[in-house]
């Protein structure tokens, strides 16, 4: 069986992974090659390598092999993500069980059956012997690890460190004993890689010697790793294609687990009144198909013969004639009692998403493991494994791949605003899922609101009742026009992006809107030389409850003496109380002869508790809000200023700390204004800017 070709089947593959040696003494050998198979052949034969090859990396970009005398479990080594790399580790060195007599066992067990420590193979104390590593090349007589260099009956053994006991076998289980499955093994994700007759399995990502349809990339949820036995198609038990050209496939000898219970992660949620997902866990008693035709009993072969029997599908609850989904179909079904209609779906069973309590998440949803897979716009989420490159572009750690299954809404980047997913739509690369925080969950996503922990500054220098006219350094101020009239303010935070409020968009027709930049007069009088008029190409509503909108411009603004961007604060930062800030706007000003000039009102930051007191305790501020009070009675934001910024200065840098939104009263004496706290949403803003495509200038 173990011919010179196809040795890649003896390796465990970890895609997009390489090994970095921390210990400089560790050796590496490299060479240009065409395929990973060539690397594998050389590693297996140790041909021309000055060490015993335990693993290799294939660099797909450079078409290069890196052979290692170590693997990911060795000390002095760490795993690292890399798009162009695939790591292959020889299974013999990472297995903790034996196949047959254990001749190929190269694991690290070094204690005998009775618990005696093994004697190192290179030592003659306490027992002299002829099993020298130099005499048994390729048998890996390393350290004091249990081995079976001659393939003797009892399995791996060693000389012991007890002078009274010359040698003893080690208690290493058979892989077929360690490996077990539940039901028919559809959820089996173990490491059995040979069939019941001992044939080595063909890798799922190979098409030789047998061509097949079960490509790992086409079925990402079926666990088609390396050449391990799987049951992707509802067979009675796991199987694999074999390396024997004359035997296409064979079952694998995997015993049923003693208690026959599934892992929590594998159990389809059992429901009796509705369908969750595809309804594999439906255990109700509906027994007609959608149009009322009764179902045939599963244990009957009349009027339709079939092999979907209770005996063949032990854990699928094929009782009576109830609708079930034993084979991963799109929903529960049954054979019908009408001889002319073989099968029918029971699509009259309602969907649990529609009829049961809503999904929710705690904290920021990083541990959410529900199975919602749509965005808030109804787009179907795309598979996580198709988007890992994009994910790595905006996070700096290895995401927990065990959580990123299928295309379910998840939060792998610790987003403050809950689960999200990638979509297949280039206009909307990713979006949040319509899941809310659980009722009563008070876990803060940012702590210490009223104590300066993180500095806000990294950056530059807002409708304003009784404010004074302003002209200097307000190039980031945007007048949002709706059907040729000023409707709201906004802040230019990037050449193609304006931060504003969600109440500013009475129509969804983007042709109704324009952004005017570089102006001082709301009608643009006298601003002709400096004015830029830009169309709007997209609106991205903020996370749940934010009242923010990021408005994408149809083309980037040209930054000059009159148009500039304003910086964002650091995420989760707190600005000290009494910091002097300003609000800007063109809204209603309280003056009868309003001149249409941009106004500024000076405010100072107020802590959330004190702010609540000023509102007579009627308002409780949360972590997404910031409060600023007027130095001058009745000075502050009002209609027409919505969307505009609360600008503060810290360390000689001006930044947008708040956004004006309706709902908190208009310049009421002794009532400080409450704004959307931009620092709370800074990560969301950066993520949108980073991931949503913008036109090039």
């Amino acid at each position: 069986q173990r011919k010179r070709r196809n040795t890649i089947h003896e390796f465990k593959k970890s895609a997009k992974t390489t090994l970095i040696k921390i210990d400089p003494a560790l050796k590496i050998k490299t060479k240009k090659v065409n395929t990973a198979d060539q690397c594998a052949n050389r590693c297996t034969r140790n041909k021309g390598l000055p060490f015993t090859c335990k693993a290799f990396v294939f660099d797909k970009a450079r078409k290069q092999c890196l052979w290692f005398p170590f693997n990911s479990m060795s000390s002095g080594v760490k795993k690292e993500f890399g798009h162009e790399f695939d790591l292959y580790e020889n299974k013999d060195y990472i297995r903790n069980c034996i196949i047959g007599k254990g001749r190929s066992y190269k694991g690290t067990v070094s204690i005998t059956k009775s618990g005696i420590k093994c004697q190192p193979w290179s030592s003659m104390i306490p027992h002299e012997h002829s099993f020298l590593p130099s005499s048994y090349r390729g048998k890996d007589l390393q350290e004091n690890y249990c081995r079976n260099p001659r393939g003797e009956e009892g399995g791996p053994w060693c000389f012991t460190s007890n002078p009274e006991v010359r040698y003893e076998v080690c208690d290493i289980p058979q892989c077929s004993e360690v490996e077990c499955m539940t039901c028919n093994g559809e959820s089996y994700r173990g490491l059995m890689d040979h069939t019941e007759s001992g044939k080595i399995c063909q890798r799922w990502d190979h098409q030789t010697p047998h061509r097949h349809k079960f490509l790992p990339e086409r079925y990402p949820d079926k666990g088609f790793d390396d050449n391990y036995c799987r049951n992707p198609d509802g067979q009675p038990r796991p199987w694999c294609y074999t390396l024997d050209p004359h035997t296409r496939w064979e079952y694998c000898a995997i015993k049923t687990c003693a208690d026959n219970t599934m892992n929590d992660t594998d159990v389809p949620l059992e429901t009796t009144e509705c369908i969750q997902g595809q309804g594999e866990g439906y255990r109700g008693t509906v027994n007609t198909i959608w149009n009322g035709i009764p179902c045939q009993r599963w244990d009957s072969q009349y009027p339709h013969e079939h092999d979907m029997t209770p005996e063949n599908f032990k854990c699928k609850d094929l009782r009576e004639n109830y609708c079930r989904n034993p084979d991963g179909s799109e929903s529960p079904w049954c054979f019908t009692t009408d001889p002319n209609i073989r099968v029918g779906y029971c699509s009259q069973i309602p969907n649990c998403d529609m009829s049961h309590g809503q999904d929710c998440y705690r904290g920021n949803g990083k541990n959410y493991m529900g199975n919602l897979s749509q965005t808030r716009s109804g787009l179907t989420c795309s598979m996580w494994d198709k988007n890992m490159e994009d994910l790595h572009r905006h996070i700096f750690w290895e995401p927990d791949a065990s959580k990123l299954n299928e295309n379910y809404c998840r939060n792998p980047d610790d987003d403050a605003h809950g689960p999200w997913c990638y979509t297949g739509n280039p206009l909307i690369p990713w979006d949040y899922c319509p899941i809310s925080r659980c009722e009563g969950d008070t876990t803060p996503t940012i702590v210490n609101l009223d104590h300066p922990v993180i500095s806000c500054a990294k950056t530059k220098q807002l409708r304003v009742v009784n404010g004074i006219p302003t002209r200097t350094n307000i190039g980031w101020m945007v007048s949002l026009r709706y059907r040729n009239k000023h409707i709201c303010g906004g802040s230019l935070i990037k050449e193609s992006w304006v931060l504003t409020a969600r109440q500013c968009f009475p129509s969804r027709d983007l042709k109704d809107y324009e952004a005017w930049l570089g102006i001082h007069d709301v009608h643009g009088r006298g601003d002709e030389k400096c004015k830029q008029v830009l169309n709007v190409s997209q609106l991205v509503y903020g996370p749940e409850g934010s009242d923010l909108v990021l408005m994408k411009l149809a083309r980037p603004a040209v930054l000059d003496d009159f148009v500039s961007t304003i910086d964002l604060p650091n995420y989760g930062c707190t600005i000290p109380e009494k910091t002097s800030c300003s609000v800007y706007g063109w809204g209603y000003t309280g003056l009868i002869n309003y001149d249409g000039l941009l106004r500024v009102a000076h405010l100072y930051i107020m802590g959330n508790e004190k702010c609540s007191q000023h509102h007579r305790g009627k308002v409780t501020l949360n972590e997404s809000e910031i409060c600023a009070g007027a130095e001058k009675i009745g000075s502050g934001p009002c209609e027409g200023d919505y969307g505009g910024p609360l600008v503060c200065e810290q360390h000689k840098m001006r930044m947008v700390l708040g956004v004006i939104v309706p709902g908190r009263g208009c310049a009421i004496p002794n009532r400080p204004g409450i704004f959307v706290r931009v620092a709370y949403y800074a990560k969301w803003i950066h993520k949108i800017i980073l991931t949503y495509k913008v036109p090039q200038s």
Partner: antibody
């Protein structure tokens, strides 16, 4: 002019089928989520189902398994295929524009057709 | 199933009156995506308010919306003759589901 025009309604027997069409003009159906909403005589509005921006379909419990929403982007038209019709499906069926790819994360119906009457009776 | 309870089911009022209609959902409405529609006999519904409190295009400022979570309100500050109609609320929920309230008929006193 931006508008939606429904057609295909009429009298049908219980158990029968009908296909409603909703022709859009002035905007592209493929960039929008589109819904069907019905109103039984003298009663309130009831959401039937939707085809989202990417064509994923969603249905209310009473429509699941019997109704199918589809769209033909080349004809800028939305369809509602109704099978196994029952007397309680008698209603005016409206087509409504929902989500829009240009406005990410907004969910409401800003444009409605004039409706088409479906009567299920023997 | 999700229940949207609108009250009152009908209200008799005079021109100039302030009218308040409430809408209560059995489940939390995602991101306060609650909208209000006006429907006149034989006509299609017309959008008035979106996102609980934002006024739709061309809608007079006498209409206003408020509320969050499960409880929402539509207020007509000074009823005009053209406002006599039936009003519906609609909520958006997880799983891409919409649900309408039963409607409130505003009649002339």
């Amino acid at each position: 002019e931006v508008q939606l025009v429904e057609s295909g309604g009429g009298l049908v027997q219980p158990g029968g089928s009908l296909r409603l069409s909703c022709a859009a003009s002035g905007f592209t159906v493929s960039s929008n989520g589109m819904s069907w909403v019905r109103q039984a005589p003298g009663k309130g509005l009831e959401w039937v189902g939707a085809s989202s921006i990417d064509g994923t379909t969603y249905y209310t419990n009473s429509a699941k398994g019997r109704f199918t929403i589809s769209r033909d982007n080349s004809k800028n038209t939305l369809y509602l295929q109704m099978n196994s019709l029952r007397a309680e499906d008698t209603a005016v069926y409206y087509c409504a524009r929902g989500e829009y790819a240009g406005v990410v994360g907004s969910n409401y119906f800003d444009l409605w057709g004039q409706g088409t009457l479906v009567t299920v009776s023997s | 199933d999700i229940q949207m309870t609108q009250s009152p089911s009908s209200v008799s009022a005079s021109v100039g009156d302030r009218v308040t209609i409430t809408c209560q959902s059995s489940q939390r409405i995602y991101s306060n995506w609650l909208s209000w529609y006006q429907q006149k006999p034989g006509k299609a519904p017309k959008l008035l308010i979106y996102a609980a409190s934002s006024l739709a295009s061309g809608v007079p400022s006498r209409f206003s919306g408020s509320g969050s979570g499960t409880d929402f309100t539509l207020t007509i500050s000074s009823l005009q003759p053209e406002d006599f109609a039936t009003y519906y609320c609609a909520g958006y929920y997880s799983g891409h589901i919409y649900s309408f309230g039963g409607g409130t008929k505003v009649e002339i006193k």
